[in-house]
């Protein structure tokens, strides 16, 4: 099921910035999603549940995000993603077991100065 | 600002079910959003922050949801919203003060058996 997740639209424009969507299987209950920009961790979001099923969300890098039951979207200013960078979603699944780590969708993003053109130069599922 | 929130599309189709979107001001940091179906509380989502700014989300009625910085969307199966029901988003604002309770957008939803037609019979902002 994880292999199917690359077939979604990873980049879109959102309020003058870029939305980067990282999809994951709906069965995943607890996870860590990291967004890499080239080799640097740009965003790091962890969702866990306690024994009372309360959700705890850790966002140590304070990335603007949106979380649903099958995706994490990170919102970047254009400045964060200019000059052409390779973005990669990396997923760690804590629950359900077994523990898994997967590199999900990846893509090369180039934003022209016009801020109107978002070109995927390379698409690596 | 709260009065402007009714002017959004409350209902939309999503994966064969219905997405009900309850918008709130972006300034709100901690809140409870309840979705009423007629007079019954169908969904109840509370977002609070702890001392380390960690987000805690309580969803005691286990509704599928999506949370962003200005909206809570609940996802219902068509069965949940057939036969015509009035849906209402009710917001409690904990932070920033002062504490406020507001009924936001409300609408009457009827889904025909074809599951292709979503008709808003009544729209009460």
């Amino acid at each position: 099921e994880l292999n199917d997740l690359a077939n979604h639209r990873m980049f879109s424009f959102h309020d003058g910035g870029v939305q980067i969507s990282c999809n994951y299987p709906e069965t995943v209950q607890q996870l860590k999603m990291q967004l890499f920009k080239d080799r640097e961790v740009l965003c790091d979001l962890t969702k866990t549940k306690g024994s009372g099923n309360t959700v705890s969300i850790k966002n140590p890098m304070s990335c603007p995000y949106q979380l649903s039951n099958n995706s994490v979207s990170f919102f970047l200013d254009n400045a964060d993603s200019s000059q052409g960078s390779y973005f990669l979603c990396s997923l760690s699944i804590f629950d359900p077991p077994p523990f898994q780590e997967k590199n999900l969708s990846g893509g090369y993003l180039l934003i022209y100065e016009s801020q109107l053109c978002c070109q995927l130069k390379l698409w690596l599922p | 600002e709260l009065n402007d929130l009714a002017n959004h599309r409350m209902f939309s189709f999503h994966d064969g079910g219905v997405q009900i979107s309850c918008n709130y001001p972006e300034t709100v940091q901690q809140l409870k959003m309840q979705l009423f179906k007629d007079r019954e509380v169908l969904c109840d989502l509370t977002k609070t922050k702890g001392s380390g700014n960690t987000v805690s989300i309580k969803n005691p009625m286990s509704c599928p949801y999506q949370l962003s910085n200005n909206s809570v969307s609940f996802f219902l199966d068509n069965a949940d919203s057939s036969q015509g029901s009035y849906f209402l988003c009710s917001l409690s604002i904990f932070d920033p003060p002062p504490f406020q309770e507001k009924n936001l957008s409300g609408g009457y939803l009827l889904i025909y058996e074809s599951q292709l037609c979503c008709q808003l019979k009544l729209w009460l902002p």
Partner: antibody
């Protein structure tokens, strides 16, 4: 190997206070929610409360809410239970447990707290 | 709060017996495709140990004679071919919501 070692139990008078500790080793302490579970002599298990990975969320059983406080020190890899206004019904063995995402997968040996005048 | 009940409260068993312990919750523990129901074993003088999580998944190292089954509100722990080292108390536990609660326990004693 995961190890949890409780300490601080003993005899305490009704209305008194006691602080229990749980030293954790063998895993990345700051990655896990942690819980306290107690067991009165000859009785079953009862959940006391929990705390999330960085200590910003804590939840409590209705039986101890307002009297007990759970905290943690991720530098010292230690979990704490501060017990105030104790009652005779708080007499129990108190276990520290790691919430392994979907179950209590590791437990300490327990420390006995006796509330008596 | 969700109330967990177990039956029987105690059971006299012999080596080789097939043992069945029942657990019932006051509301469904099914969320999505998961039942938030766990089984623990506690031997005399020891801390509890995890046996089964998500109603039917055996924890690492747990012998395959232990089997969990059930869904919704009714669950069963089965020990196929009971061994004397299986003596002790068995507890079901839910983590569907707060507060998580345990069943009252089932004590297995030698016949």
């Amino acid at each position: 190997e995961v190890q949890l070692v409780e300490s601080g139990g003993g005899l305490v008078k009704p209305g008194g206070s006691l602080k229990l500790s749980c030293a954790a080793s063998g895993f990345t302490f700051s990655d896990y929610w942690m819980d306290w579970v107690r067991q009165a002599p000859g009785k079953g298990l009862e959940w006391v409360g929990n705390i999330d990975e960085d200590g910003s969320i804590a939840e409590y059983s209705p039986f101890v809410k307002g009297r007990f406080t759970i905290s943690r020190d991720n530098v010292k890899n230690t979990l704490y239970l501060q017990m105030n206004s104790v009652k005779s019904e708080d007499t129990a063995t108190y276990y520290c447990s790691r919430w392994g995402r979907f179950a209590f997968d590791s437990w300490g040996q327990g420390t006995l707290v006796t509330v008596s005048s | 709060d969700i109330v967990m009940t177990q039956s029987p409260s105690s059971l006299a068993v012999s080596a080789g017996d097939r043992v069945t312990i029942n657990c019932k919750s006051s509301q469904s523990l099914l969320s999505g495709s998961f039942n938030y129901l766990t089984w623990y074993q506690q031997k005399t003088g020891q801390a509890p140990k995890l046996l089964i999580f998500y109603a039917s998944t055996r924890h690492t190292g747990v012998p395959d004679r232990f089997m969990g089954s059930g869904s919704g509100t009714d669950f069963t722990l089965t020990i196929n071919s009971f061994q004397t080292e299986d003596l002790g108390d068995y507890y079901c536990h839910h983590h569907y919501n707060a507060p998580p609660t345990f069943g009252p326990g089932t004590k297995l004693e030698l016949r």
